[in-house]
Amino acid sequence: MEDEKPKVNPKLYMCVCEGLSCGNEDHCEGQQCFSSLSINDGFHVYQKGCFQVYEQGKMTCKTPPSPGQAVECCQGDWCNRNITAQLPTKGKSFPGTQNFHLE
């Protein structure tokens, strides 16, 4: 099945924004929302935000999770509010990756 082509006037969604690119804003507007987790020197850094450009989101959102980074994307107003990106679980589709639990 072919990728969905961007519409001429793409719908923009309101997204939760948390992270280095957000400045003083707690929200942003874009064609896709995301929630990400990256491992920086062994520390978990969670971010949320939006992709303003369709192609940017398309590339990032299709990247499979790795031991050091995971991104989850969605379309819909505030759809990333309750999404927390997870690194791949041991034994599931991405060998050699880690499992994390919140205690």
């Epitope: 948390e18 280095l20 850094v45 050699g96 499992n99």
Partner: antibody
Framework: EVQLVETGGGLVQPGRSLKLSCVAS????????MYWIRQAPGKGLEWISS????????YYPDSVKGRFAISRDNAENTVYLQMNSLRSEDTATYYC???????????WGQGTLVTVSS | DIQMTQSPSLLSASVGDRVTLSCKAS??????LNWFQQKLGEAPKLLIY???SLQTGIPSRFSGSGSGTDFTLTISSLQPEDVAIYFC????????FGPGTKLELK
């Protein structure tokens, strides 16, 4: 109750090696990243090393890279710090710590003192 | 590397005082900042994580605020047991601690 107990500190001559251990209890050890942080006498804190859950990824600052090595044994609930080519500036109390994914360095051990001196 | 500075380096205050400690980052670290308390002869203890979240079991007189480069730890009513050194810690990139603020009783 989370407990982290460091051992292995002591007096060592410059250029020699020392291996520290940290035994963990009170949580599922294999699910968590672990860390070493040090504090020179009367000084501030310095992050020294991190290790992921299965030991496959390790992280160090430039100050110890190539000299120190972190490892873990999930069967023994233990994280190690192998310190080689020790220098006088490595003299410090070495703390073992754990995070939860959303709370970095939430729990610390009591520390073990390493003194590097001739 | 991101540098962390804390001010003042030494603070004298009286029991019951509202105390404010400052931590500044050399570049944007969003809210990726923790505050630790270290009493003499003890290991550091986590007070605040993610800039403003109170760690479980920590008295509510402690609070944190800030985002980007400027952060504050506030003790609403100083107690004798709060005498300690307070460190901030950033984990946005290349984890680093601030040099600490020593809090003593007047």
């Amino acid at each position: 109750e989370v407990q982290l107990v460091e051992t292995g500190g002591g007096l060592v001559q410059p250029g020699r090696s020392l291996k520290l251990s940290c035994v963990a209890s009170g949580f599922t050890f294999s699910n968590y990243y672990m860390y070493w942080i040090r504090q020179a006498p009367g000084k501030g804190l310095e992050w020294i090393s991190s290790i992921n859950t299965d030991g496959g990824s390790t992280y160090y600052p430039d100050s110890v890279k190539g000299r120190f090595a972190i490892s873990r044994d999930n069967a023994e609930n233990t994280v190690y710090l192998q310190m080689n080519s020790l220098r006088s500036e490595d003299t410090a109390t070495y703390y073992c710590a754990k995070s939860t994914p959303n709370i970095p360095l939430a729990y610390w051990g009591q520390g073990t003192l390493v003194t590097v001196s001739s | 590397d991101i540098q962390m500075t804390q001010s003042p380096s030494l603070l004298s205050a009286s029991v019951g005082d509202r105390v404010t400690l400052s931590c500044k980052a050399s570049q944007n670290i969003y809210k990726y900042l923790n505050w630790f308390q270290q009493k003499l002869g003890e290991a550091p203890k986590l007070l605040i994580y993610y800039s403003n979240s109170l760690q479980t079991g920590i008295p509510s007189r402690f609070s944190g605020s800030g985002s980007g480069t400027d952060f504050t730890l506030t003790i609403s009513s100083l107690q004798p047991e709060d005498v300690a050194i307070y460190f901030c810690f950033q984990y946005s990139s290349g984890p680093t601690f601030g040099p600490g603020t020593k809090l003593e009783l007047k």
